[in-house]
């Protein structure tokens, strides 16, 4: 008789999840020789322990603590790039600008990027059929709690000028409910962070509006200013040209506004 299984609204655990996490860990430690000391089996065991046999709507930051203490690494605190709803461009940028880091350029972020996972209460099985959706099912699911936990600590590490890439094509360019808006903004340390600089990425080719005047950007400025952190904003009208100019800053066309 097949065992009854809770049906959630979100997609199930990414196929070959354990193998993927372990392989990513090994790859990361090979790419970053300073991380050679990391024991990837211990990392996987700690990751697995956070959600296996636990109700996927009852996950806490506490569950991830054994994982959170692993993989200590050095990220220059003045080279942190946050992003919201524009991950691909942010990652393309740090692939070119190698001295800047998104959360997904760190070990824990790299392990979990684009993956989904959850378990089931009282069984050691991974649920490959469905996992809770943040809106439709519950917010305390394994994936959401993981990103909240690592995002908080990443933001706490930032100093000097912190950059954030925002998607100018969305109705809410700054969304208070995003991980950036609900976690990272509130965990920047005012005694260390001097300025938050927003880069608003334009979508349309002919879009010449100043999206830094958008009401949601003004809302972000207000939140940041109240935390005694300065705020600045730049329009990136041509993201393709922007990336090209990061690659080749000497190019004559890169002196004009991008």
């Amino acid at each position: 008789v097949p065992r009854w299984r809770q049906q959630w609204s979100g997609p199930g655990t990414t196929k070959r999840f354990p193998e993927t996490v372990l392989a990513r860990c090994v790859k990361y430690t090979e790419i970053h020789p300073e991380m050679r000391h990391v024991d990837c089996q211990s990392v996987w065991d700690a990751f697995k322990g956070a959600f296996i046999s636990k109700h996927p709507c009852n996950i806490t930051e506490e569950d991830y603590q054994p994982l959170m203490k692993l993989g200590t690494q050095t990220v220059p605190c003045n080279k942190i790039l946050l992003w919201s709803r524009i991950k691909d461009l942010a990652h393309q940028f740090t692939q070119v600008q190698r001295d800047m880091f998104t959360l997904e350029d760190t070990l824990l972020g790299y392990l979990a990027d684009d993956l989904t996972w959850c378990g089931e209460f009282n069984t050691s099985k991974i649920n490959y059929q469905s996992c809770p959706d943040w809106r439709k099912d519950c917010s305390n699911n394994p994936v959401s709690v993981f990103w909240k936990t690592v995002s908080r600590r990443f933001a706490e590490a930032a100093c000097d000028v912190v950059h954030v890439m925002l998607n100018g094509s969305r109705s809410k360019i700054f969304d208070k409910n995003s991980t950036f808006g609900s976690v990272e903004v509130h965990n920047l340390q005012p005694e260390k962070v001097q300025t938050l600089e927003a880069w608003v990425i334009h979508g349309g080719r002919e879009d010449s509006r100043d999206l830094c005047q958008d009401p949601t950007i003004k809302e972000l400025e207000s939140i940041i200013s109240k935390r005694n952190i300065q705020f600045s904003c730049k329009n990136i009208y041509r993201p393709d040209k922007f990336l090209q100019c990061v690659k080749n800053p000497e190019d004559s066309s890169c002196t004009s506004e991008i």
Epitope: E61, E62, Q65, M68, K69, Q73, C77, R152, A157
Partner: antibody, heavy 120, light 108 residues
Amino acid sequence: QVQLQQSGAELARPGASVKLSCKASGYTFNTYWMQWVKQRPGQGLEWIGAIYPGDGDITYNQKFKGKATLTADKSSNTAYMHLSSLASEDSAVYYCAREGYYYGGALDYWGQGTSVTVSS
Amino acid sequence: QIFLTQSPAIMSASLGERVTMTCTASSSVSSSYLHWYQQKPGSPPKLWMYGTSNLASGVPPRFSGSGSGTSYSLTISSMEAEDAATYYCHRYHRSPWTFGGGTKLEIK
């Protein structure tokens, strides 16, 4: 603002014990190792041990096993160090310090220190 | 266990002078995990530099760090009065941790 507030100076007799506290604020206490460091007058820094409040994991410098006992109370965001069988060589300033996860394990915030004097 | 030896133990420099102090490890250390602290009398140490060359928040840009393997250094391009202090190097490792013996920098 991140702060580590340590308890006040202690004067103790040889053979006695003391419990020092370090109250953390301004960050998520659970997700950072808390380190303890000893400094004798006019001397350098000596590592005692560390505790990870998130899961209670503890690691000690072999030299201080049996001398120092580390604990943490997550509900009050406070780390403790119990020093037993005090002797004159335990007279020192003891610091708690937070290990910065993205700072390569460097100690990015320090308490003001607690002075322990052992004297008969 | 890796030991860190700092040299010189004590040094003095005139205002405006370039200052370099070294930290030598008994065996190779990853540059990502070699850190420096500044301590002044009566105060706790302060994180000064992390991962060999990254300045901690608020540290003046006249400070720089370099090195790899077993040899690391902290340099002040132009000594200022407020730089007089003791500097400790430190190697991160889960256990045991090690600090160097310190270099005391005085004003000549």
